[in-house]
């Protein structure tokens, strides 16, 4: 798995380089996670025909994956920094159970799946430091998450492959929207 941001050999070799600002660190972290998702998607697409699945079939699912909407204040029109930051953190916290589900779903990219999960936890911590209104952030209920995970793991082989594909696609879209929004902050 690639080395997480801030831990590569270049950082060691160049000690007098300016330390990254909070925003730069967050930006770099998101791009690192997106690279990890690309690698996981590559394995998923090589293994099955899931990536050719129709948008209709993907839309017709029983998952409740976080998605950016106008009211979240993350789009250019109606942009609201505080509302948007709360949405990003809440969304990432909601994605955590799905990232846990992705573990033991990959053969050659097993470490990559773990790296995506761990890097997301770090990203959440970075963003929580940035947020002023932490009270507005709702943390998912662990019991609900546990039963959701059990239900997802009970699915048949095809459904699990589809679920994996959809989680990766949705997480990628969520992170890309987050990255655009955070660059405006």
């Amino acid at each position: 798995a690639p080395v997480p941001p801030g831990e590569d050999s270049k950082d060691v070799a160049a000690p007098h380089r300016q330390p990254l600002t909070s925003s730069e660190r967050i930006d770099k972290q998101i791009r690192y996670i997106l690279d990890g998702i690309s690698a996981l998607r590559k394995e998923t697409c090589n293994k099955s025909n899931m990536c050719e699945s129709s948008k209709e079939a993907l839309a017709e699912n029983n998952l409740n994956l976080p998605k950016m909407a106008e009211k979240d204040g993350c789009f250019q029109s109606g942009f609201n920094e505080e509302t948007c930051l709360v949405k990003i953190i809440t969304g990432l916290l909601e994605f955590e159970v799905y990232l846990e589900y992705l573990q033991n779903r990959f053969e050659s990219s097993e470490e990559q799946a773990r790296a995506v999960q761990m890097s997301t936890k770090v990203l959440i911590q970075f963003l929580q430091k940035k947020a002023k209104n932490l009270d507005a952030i709702t943390t998912p209920d662990p019991t609900t998450n546990a039963s959701l995970l059990t239900k997802l793991q009970a699915q048949n082989q095809w459904l699990q492959d589809m679920t994996t594909h959809l989680i990766l696609r949705s997480f990628k879209e969520f992170l890309q929207s987050s990255l655009r929004a955070l660059r405006q902050m």
Partner: antibody, heavy 121, light 111 residues
């Protein structure tokens, strides 16, 4: 042509053990989850166990009625799946089928001919 | 667990007529555009034979007179026209999630 064939059934005393084997052909075995299903006049058709892939750490799932007594395993190099049955009870009597489940609406499921397991004193 | 309730328990149909067997699931077996409901035919001394998978897809070598329909929780198997060879037990099965479950069966006979 997809084929699954069971073996290893027979007569066993209550509390005894037995190992069923299933060999598959006609498809890339290592790419598919595999299952055991059983049938008895008393309980009808009943799913018993499932084993997943290497990428899933060979995760297993069992029917409540066999949990802790039965163990499903696989050997991808031999295209085989096994069912180790311990502490057998009279109610475990039945025909045991090895099945390769379907995949979405692309591929259908395949069942073997079955092997009879009789648990009796 | 998803419970499957099959009806009727037995059915007698005249040759050439239509036989309809129903199967109701205790919760939806539908996801990503597919309903994971299968139908099997079983004759004495033989293993179950797959007739229909994913609610409406015909198994290989299955005659066109067998058809499946339904979505979500309510499904049916239709046999038309009924032939002598169709005398058998019929089972529905959900393969959406473990534990995979079966209906109690329907005994189909000729009237």
């Amino acid at each position: 042509e997809v084929k699954v064939e069971e073996s290893g059934g027979g007569l066993v005393q209550p509390g005894g053990s037995m190992k069923l084997s299933c060999v598959a052909s006609g498809f890339t075995f290592s790419n598919y989850w595999m299952n055991w299903v059983r049938q008895s006049p008393e309980k009808g058709l009943e799913w018993v166990a499932e084993i997943r892939l290497k990428s899933n750490n060979y995760a297993t799932h069992y029917a409540e009625s066999v949990k802790g007594r039965f163990t499903i395993s696989r050997d991808d190099s031999k295209s085989s799946v096994y069912l180790q049955m311990n502490n057998l009870r009279a109610e475990d009597t039945g025909i045991y089928y090895c099945t390769r489940p379907g995949y979405g609406n692309y591929e259908e499921a395949y069942w073997g001919q079955g092997t009879l397991v009789t648990v009796s004193a | 667990d998803i419970v499957l309730t099959q009806s009727p328990a037995s059915l007698a149909v005249s040759l050439g007529q239509r036989a309809t067997i129903s199967c109701r699931a205790s919760e939806s077996v539908h996801n990503f555009g597919i309903s994971f409901m299968n139908w099997f035919q079983q004759k004495p001394g033989q293993p179950p034979k797959l007739l229909i998978y994913a609610a409406s897809n015909q198994g290989s070598g299955v005659p066109a007179r067998f058809s499946g329909s339904g979505s979500g929780t309510d499904f049916s198997l239709n046999i038309h026209p009924m032939e002598e060879d169709d005398t058998a037990m019929y089972f529905c099965q959900q393969s959406k999630e473990v534990p995979y479950t079966f209906g109690g069966g329907t005994k189909l006979e000729i009237k």
